[in-house]
């Protein structure tokens, strides 16, 4: 988790003194509890918005959009927390906004906004605005939460994202799988611009069942630059296994912008259809 | 423009089923989440349902949870609601409604629904 270039974060706006510090996410009231305290923000908004480094680099943020309500509490009102956690590493990262100045009622709502936390693509994050100072121990909770969902670099807009971009999420292999005799499948797929290896892992199933019978790995060296954008045909061997029938075939990418951490292609191949009543087999000749 | 057509509401009977549909049009539908809100009679607008853009991630109302399904279909931009085991209670106007934003939110909208359909009626009685 980080921000977006550290260049000046502004939370100013007409009416209000405003700096955007960066915090602990361990504000001091928590540790010094006041006895006056304002009211939760209203109308927490998340949205998916895309901003260009300095360097030109275009990265997903998170744009983080809130209300005030309209009651005395914000006469208390020194600032707000932001906290960003990631789900699934735990990491946690917050701003402060601290009000320079006391916020005064006026003829429209109180709206703050702020677009600078870099989110990862299908990550998960648990948004949170806390209004300062924070409550007393037994007080009302004066925060409000979502958890936030990106997509991943399979999303359209995502796909054009300089993290998707590195892990190769440009690169469409437009897999072909086919079954050919004597246990085989014929695995056909479009090379990228760049010389580097790939792999082809292939996993058999049962019918309905998701163990796995049958797993293989197939090496494909460095294509040479003629051979860019090309069709790479590979013929691969199943063993003979009888219902061992469902394929999935991945192909493992090791471009060098991502290394063995490449998105990952596959197809898969189900198993023939069974006739709903096999034809039963006379076990006599008829003579007419 | 931007439409969103519902279909698939009816009277049926306690315990039964119907499954409502959603025809999108007017923008790129795998881009967005969608979720399905109703309005019982006399009711203000309860969430029932959220859809991820891919369905990669689902999310239900309580009420709703082991009865209702969502589902979408990207190649026909439509939307879906299977229901199953009505109640009185389901009694509704059922609404599809659009995300606002990129991303999806657990338990409702991430920002706003900024657009709605004309909503479908299911009716549960015996």
């Known amino acids: 988790l980080r921000l977006l270039d550290h260049r000046a974060l502004v939370c100013s706006q007409p009416g209000l003194n405003c700096t955007v510090k960066n915090s602990t996410c361990l504000d001091d009231s928590w540790i010094h509890p006041r006895n006056l305290t304002p009211s939760s923000p209203k109308d927490l908004q998340i949205q998916l918005h895309f901003a260009h480094t300095q360097q030109g680099d275009l990265f997903p943020v998170a744009h983080i959009e809130w209300t005030l309500q309209t009651d005395a509490s914000i006469l208390y009102l020194e600032g707000a927390e932001l906290s960003v956690l990631q789900l699934n590493t735990n990491e946690r990262l917050c701003v402060r906004f601290e009000f320079l100045s006391k916020l005064r009622h006026h003829h429209r709502r109180w709206r703050f906004t702020f677009s600078h936390f870099v989110v990862d693509p299908d990550q998960e994050y648990e948004v949170t605005v806390h209004h300062l100072p924070k409550p007393i121990p037994d007080g009302d909770p004066n925060h409000q939460s979502k958890n936030f969902l990106v997509p991943d670099c399979e999303h359209a807009r995502m796909k054009v994202t300089t993290p998707c971009m590195s892990s190769g999420s440009l690169w469409d292999p437009n897999i072909t799988v086919e079954t050919l005799e004597a246990h085989q499948l014929r695995v056909s797929f479009t090379l990228w611009n760049e010389s580097t290896h790939y792999q082809i892992l292939l996993t058999s199933f049962p019918h309905m069942e998701n163990h796995s019978c049958f797993e293989h790995m197939h090496h494909i060296p460095a294509p040479r630059p003629e051979e860019f954008h090309q069709r790479s045909n590979v013929t691969l061997t199943l063993r003979n296994l009888k219902g061992c029938c469902r394929h999935q075939v991945q192909i493992q990418p090791f471009f060098s912008s991502c290394l063995n951490d490449c998105l990952r292609h596959s197809a898969t191949v189900s198993c023939p259809e069974m006739p709903d009543t096999p034809e039963p087999i006379p076990d006599y000749m008829p003579l007419w | 423009q931007v439409q969103l057509v519902e279909s698939g509401g009816g009277l049926v009977q306690p315990g039964r089923s119907l499954r409502l549909s959603c025809a999108a049009s007017?923008?790129?539908?795998?881009?967005?989440?969608m979720h399905w809100v109703r309005q019982g009679p006399g009711k203000g607008l309860e969430w029932v349902s959220g859809i991820s853009w891919n369905g990669g991630t689902i999310d239900y109302a309580d009420s709703v949870k082991g009865r209702f399904t969502i589902s979408r279909d990207n190649a026909k931009n439509s939307l879906y609601l299977q229901m199953n085991s009505l109640r009185p209670e389901d009694t509704a106007l059922y609404y599809c409604?659009?995300?606002?934003?990129?991303?999806?939110?657990?338990?409702?909208?991430?920002?706003?629904?900024?657009?709605w359909g004309q909503g479908t009626l299911v009716t549960v009685s015996s």
């Open positions: 409604a659009k995300e606002e934003g990129l991303g999806f939110c657990r338990g409702g909208s991430c920002s706003t629904f900024d657009y």
């Open positions: 007017g923008f790129t539908f795998d881009d967005y989440a």
